[in-house]
Amino acid sequence: KRFHDVLGNERPSAYMREHNQLNGWSSDENDWNEKLYPVWKRGDMRWKNSWKGGRVQAVLTSDSPALVGSNITFVVNLVFPRCQKEDANGNIVYEKNCRNEAGLSADPYVYNWTAWSEDSDGENGTGQSHHNVFPDGKPFPHHPGWRRWNFVYVFHTLGQYFQKLGRCSVRVSVNTANVTLGPQLMEVTVYRRHGRAYVPIAQVKDVYVVTDQIPVFVTMSQKNDRNSSDETFLKDLPITFDVLIHDPSHFLNYSTINYKWSFGDNTGLFVSINHTVNHTYVLNGTFSLNLTVKAAAPGPCPPPPPPPPRPPKPTPSLGPAGDNPLGLSEIPDENCQINRYGHFQATITIVEGILEVNIIQTTDVLMLVPGPDSSLIDFVVTCQGSIPTEVCTIISDPTCEITQNAVCSPVDVDEMCLLTVRRAFNGSGTYCVNLTLGDDTSLALTSTLISVPDRDPASSLRMAN
């Protein structure tokens, strides 16, 4: 059998391999050692017994999408049946005091590979033996502690494979410089050590994407905006736009990045080198926001100009696949730069909202029949912008951290936006009061510290804004 017979549904073409050469990966036309690494089709009954106590699940993730030329990283995590985990020596053990369907286990080990490797014979002086090899026959790398690595991972994409010895989690990074743009498929097969051979325990696949567009995300936030995710914002208050470039391999770290904004409100283009920008809309309505991100990134060098047509210059002929796989134009080994672009577009709605709220007066209400240890206080509040429909007060300790009381109530306010909010305080002392006015789209907050005196008729109320 060959690798493509084992790892994929269909034999990839040489064309695919030649056009997507991955550094350090091998052609899936290579032979697979089926004696050491048995191959089971989907639905084979042997899968049921490939792992003691249930099935192992492999979870494959990647930091896709990847900007072409950058590195994309794949991570495989093995999820063991309930109550099982990998210990420091790479053995699989039962978790202490964990009960699964089989109850508590007397044997602490699910797989005691340390014992197996110590019993193993047929080794030469280097600690290498005929079974410490990958499916293509290459020997395992002897990193320190490699004996504690009991899983073999075979990654397969674009007609090529990569083998890795590891523990219950491995990561592999691939440079995408030669990868065709668009969605691609990564498949991973995982084997576990089994005496002097290996047993398949899991297979997983995931789609990843290589793009020549910078992946761009924009977060939009605004003070007093009630719901930051509905793309509805308030007139006359600055909106903060924060651009996040998805670049997990730091490919663009040394690039100069320019942000070109069009806010859709006839304010023209705004060019910035800062990833954060503020903009205030002064009219209500719907606006089309456009962002273009430009970065000078490492990229392919243009081919040299072709030689003059006559006399024809001999060019190396294209040999069989593998000799000179691409017959490429000579690409100089220079550090060339190429402008990469990313785009973001959003439609945002601008509406009236409560822009500001202020407490302009605080008055102690003298009660005819004072309650035991209770004070009533009136807060006179003004606001700007739209008319609020509700008021909330949160009374907490002086640090404003421990809430003691929260009350919300509807309000009916005139155009002047002047209202009085009455609240009760239990006992004397200093309180933090958070007062918010809200409507459908906005929520405006103000805070104050007040001192409630003892119930002594001579005492007065103090407020510190």
Partner: antibody, heavy 119, light 107 residues
């Protein structure tokens, strides 16, 4: 929808050069290799070579090495095929064809450009 | 280079009858083989790719089969609009190659 529009017919003298253009639209131009295939009158199809618009890597059939040059203008999403030292047997319809991802089969073809080489 | 041998050169079949075209490659290209239909004055039209996968919009009377070095295009019930030249193409490796073509006519 994907469209490949080629330049018009050409009549050339032996020894001259011809440059045929193929303007692409309806897809991300840099994402797919573009190929050139020719067909002499009453004959079969013959693959000439390919170019990657993203990095301008080229790959030519041995028969055309040294005589063919494929180039790209990303700003106009256009691929060019120039064939030099023309001879009468180069009289043919020249097609551009777009491959599909990592697969070199052609679902999209230009309408063809007839190049006639005659003294 | 891979050599493509297509047979027969021409084929006359009655309307509604089955037409079978063969394509042999000099080395294993499985499953990277495509079939095209070409009518006079038009570019080729993709029918089948990867030996047996029918391209979008292609009538199901067209089917592809085969593996290794031997491949077949079958038109299960020939229609008048199927009169054309049919080409196979290996898309396994570069240089890409086409078969010599098979002309299908109505008997």
């Amino acid at each position: 929808q994907v469209q490949l529009v080629q330049s018009g017919a050409e009549v050339k003298k032996p020894g001259a050069s011809v440059k045929v253009s193929c303007k692409a639209s309806g897809y991300t131009f840099t994402s797919y290799w573009m190929h050139w295939v020719r067909q002499a009158p009453g004959q079969g199809l013959e693959w000439m070579g390919e170019i990657n618009p993203y990095d301008q890597r080229t790959n030519y059939a041995q028969k055309f090495q040294g005589r063919v040059t494929m180039t790209v203008d990303k700003s106009t999403s256009t691929v060019y095929m120039e064939l030099s030292s023309l001879r009468s047997e180069d009289t043919a319809v020249y097609y551009c064809a777009r491959s599909t991802g990592n697969y070199a089969w052609f679902a999209y073809w230009g309408q063809g450009t007839l190049v006639t080489v005659s003294s | 280079d891979i050599v493509m041998t297509q047979s027969p050169d021409s084929l006359a079949v009655s309307l509604g009858e089955r037409a079978t075209i063969n394509c042999k490659t000099s080395q294993d290209v499985s499953p990277s083989l495509a079939w095209y239909q070409q009518k006079p004055g038009q570019p080729p039209k993709l029918l089948i790719y990867s030996a047996s996968k029918r391209y979008t919009g292609v009538p199901d009377r067209f089917s592809g089969s085969g593996s290794g070095t031997d491949f077949t295009l079958t038109i299960s019930s020939l229609q008048a609009e199927d009169v054309a030249v049919y080409y196979c193409q290996q898309h396994y490796s570069i240089p890409l190659q086409f078969g010599g073509g098979t002309k299908v006519e109505i008997k």
